[in-house]
Interface confidence: low
Amino acid sequence: GELETSDVVTVVLGQDAKLPCFYRGDSGEQVGQVAWARVDAGEGAQELALLHSKYGLHVSPAYEGRVEQPPPPRNPLDGSVLLRNAVQADEGEYECRVSTFPAGSFQARLRLRVLVPPLPSLNPGPALEEGQGLTLAASCTAEGSPAPSVTWDTEVKGTTSSRSFKHSRSAAVTSEFHLVPSRSMNGQPLTCVVSHPGLLQDQRITHILHVSFLAEASVRGLEDQNLWHIGREGAMLKCLSEGQPPPSYNWTRLDGPLPSGVRVDGDTLGFPPLTTEHSGIYVCHVSNEFSSRDSQVTVDVLDPQEDSGKQVDLVSAS
């Protein structure tokens, strides 16, 4: 007869490992006992369990409650055992020694490999601001056995760098994602993807990018200069910008206080029926936590009685 086993048994941390040992004998042969031992190189054999055809299962105190026979129905020639709740320390070499009659003893070895799935963590980098150079967006770390694979899934353009630290029974892999922040990245997902043989599917951790920025300011409303004449109603100036966080707006007049009757409503400056006193230089100040911008315009209210043209001067400043 001969023993049937596996060269390598692979199990995920916390799962039950079946250590196979089956004697395929000739007709009439019987198995008297099967002895299991841990036989790591450089160490003496450590008894694990004994399956006896008459006396049943014996388990070493070191493995009490963790070694069982497979559930029935059992073949009397099957000396396999279950190692419950595998831990990293269980990884190593095991030997089954089968005593048969009348054929004698047989032995076989197998290696138990315990996979330790990673528990990845994602850590965002410093606050992202438009105008920065290459900046750390996030780092992702995963430790397992064997070493996990850490990659990134994103439509954002960037560069990655990885480093690995080996421990006695595992390895930690850290991957960093660097990018040059731009406003188009706002709200884009940056996903760390961790692959490992102990995972049924890749683990994914998504971080949403937030990039602070403030666009240049401009003022709309003076496009048709002929509309800015004495008596016109509903005249308004609108300050245009965008930012993250959303900006706030403030209106001032460079050459004096805002005329009475002029209404400030956020980004909009509303005028009462126009008079010449509304002529002047108006400044829109846009700001958020990231930056501030100014845009100024010159309003020249035309008097229809006069045949002089109006000049509009647009100036933007940061």
Epitope: S121, L122, R204, T206, I208, H210, S212, Q244, P246, E289
Partner: nanobody, 118 residues
Framework: EVQLLESGGGLVQPGGSLRLSCAAS????????MGWYRQAPGKERELVSS????????HYADSVKGRFTISRDNSKNTLYLQMNSLKPEDTAVYYC???????????WGQGTQVTVSS
């Protein structure tokens, strides 16, 4: 155990409004970004809006800009999505998502159905 529980969905006529809420429990800190995703039948899940841990940074998908407003109340561990001027194409299951940067975990709610129809 971390749980995200959405509420506030329902049936609304075009042009109407809804306010979605997402109550987070089991999270020991408010230091995490959150977002609203939606998934219409036969389509991929898409990000609608997201908000930073402080609430100071927000983002909106182009399709909802000017109509939806995201906010959060960290004292109540609750995320909100105010949806105005709703359109039939806003019909979807809306999911709340918490992106826990300091543990690397990513938690999802079970979703709440929003139907916009006359």
């Amino acid at each position: 155990e971390v749980q995200l529980l959405e509420s506030g969905g329902g049936l609304v006529q075009p042009g109407g409004s809804l306010r979605l809420s997402c109550a987070a429990s089991g999270l020991t800190s408010s230091g995490y970004a959150m977002g609203w995703y939606r998934q219409a039948p036969g389509k991929e899940r898409e990000l609608v809006s997201s908000i930073s841990s402080s609430g100071g940074l927000t983002h909106y998908a182009d399709s909802v800009k000017g109509r939806f407003t995201i906010s959060r109340d960290n004292s109540k561990n609750t995320l909100y999505l105010q949806m105005n001027s709703l359109k039939p194409e806003d019909t979807a299951v809306y999911y709340c998502d918490a992106d826990i940067a300091y543990t690397g975990a990513d938690y999802w709610g079970q979703g709440t159905q929003v139907t916009v129809s006359s």
